[in-house]
Interface confidence: medium
């Protein structure tokens, strides 16, 4: 799937539009929001009923080259004496984000857009029972 | 930037690390990953804190589309079904990266843009500050 | 960062209805629960109540239950305090406060509060 051209549907493209070669587009990889603070709650992947550990995976050819990655600790969630209650689920709770991938081509070096799914985090939920006839 | 390993028969005048810009082919890798939420689990209704999915909608943006978490309660969802104010439901956010157009309107130009997004609930014990 | 500004406090007569303002810069409000808080002369900050991000849920201090309203409205970055049969006991600077999360808020170490808006009951 391409990226939607919104200047055919939405608005007039400007006139002041960078001149861009056939199926590809010009990518500014200074980002806007880089400095901005993130204010989490504290150690919440710790202190939750369904606690999660971080993973770094990193990647040279990725920009950015870093992704955290979260995974459950748990199957079942933790209940109000800190014991694993496996009558409830611990799950992951996943985003999409976009990393600029570098391939090498022999000598040559191409850039493609990548969709990269995160597990941010971990949810506690009550399972599904399918009741087997 | 970053630095990346350098194919050593290659010409020595490639960068190590990323170029401010770059030309990317359009096509996106990946890019059929379900991006409604609401399709892709129920967690949002079955989680012991649950949350309300928010539209967020911006034609300048890539994807145009974001789904916004908002924790539905305070407390947690106890056995009962019951809101459980000893525990708390609090949003789990991420930076991710989008897509901004650059310069506005342009159909093939964009800028890397780092957003904070809610994403979903959890349930944490409170930290309790006992006043002296 | 989220900034909180108050307004609406003033005098008002025993009995009568008040309501507090509290409008908030930054994007991210609704990610916020926000709640009041207030201060009388010589007293310790008392928790009125908080709600969610989402509106959903509001938690009050059991003592103004009745008499008091929380309410937001996340287009406008606006959180308020509808306050009716004022006492003089009433009488305090009320304040607005956020955190991520509800238990911080609820023990008055939230991260981010507002200067205050002084309300007046006479009676």
């Known amino acids: 799937r391409k990226i939607p051209k919104v200047g055919h549907t939405f608005f007039q493209k400007p006139e002041s539009c960078p001149p861009v070669p056939g199926g590809s587009m010009k990518l500014d990889i200074g980002i806007i929001n880089e400095n901005q603070r993130v204010s989490m709650s504290r150690n919440i992947e710790s202190r939750s009923t369904s606690p999660w550990n971080y993973t770094v995976t990193w990647d040279p050819n990725r920009y950015p080259s870093e992704v955290v990655q979260a995974q459950c600790r748990n199957l079942g969630c933790i209940n109000a004496q800190g014991k694993e209650d496996i009558s409830m689920n611990s799950v992951p709770i996943q985003q999409e984000t976009l990393v600029v991938r570098r391939k090498h081509q022999g000598c040559s070096v191409s850039f493609q857009l990548e969709k990269v799914l995160v597990t941010v985090g971990c949810t506690c939920v009550t399972p599904v029972i399918h009741h087997v006839q | 930037g970053i630095t990346i390993p350098r194919n050593p028969g290659c010409p020595n005048s490639e960068d190590k690390n990323f170029p401010r810009t770059v030309m990317v082919n359009l096509n996106i890798h990946n890019r059929n990953t379900n991006t409604n939420p609401k399709r892709s689990s129920d967690y949002y209704n079955r989680s012991t804190s649950p949350w309300n999915l928010h539209r967020n909608e911006d034609p300048e943006r890539y994807p145009s589309v974001i789904w916004e978490a908002k924790c539905r309660h305070l407390g947690c969802i106890n056995a009962d079904g019951n809101v459980d104010y000893h525990m708390n439901s609090v949003p789990i956010q991420q930076e991710i990266l989008v897509l901004r157009r650059e310069p506005p309107h342009c159909p093939n130009s964009f800028r890397l843009e780092k957003i904070l997004v809610s994403v979903g609930c959890t349930c944490v014990t409170p930290i309790v500050h006992h006043v002296a | 960062e989220v900034q909180l500004v108050e307004s609406g406090g003033g005098l008002v007569q025993a009995g009568g209805s008040l309501r507090l303002s509290c409008a908030a810069s930054g994007r991210t409000f609704s990610s916020y629960v926000v709640g009041w808080f207030r201060q009388a002369p010589g007293k310790e900050r008392e928790f009125i109540g908080a709600?969610?991000?989402?509106?959903?849920?509001?938690y009050y201090a059991v003592s103004e239950k009745d008499r008091f309203t929380i309410s937001r409205d996340n287009g406008k970055n606006t959180l308020y305090l509808q306050m009716s049969s004022l006492k003089a006991e009433d009488t305090a600077v009320y304040y607005c406060?956020?955190?991520?999360?509800?238990?911080?808020?609820?023990?008055?170490?939230?991260?981010?509060w507002g200067q205050g808006t002084q309300v007046t009951v006479s009676s």
């Open positions: 709600i969610s991000g989402s509106g959903d849920s509001i």
């Open positions: 406060t956020a955190d991520q999360e509800f238990g911080y808020l609820r023990f008055g170490r939230s991260e981010y």
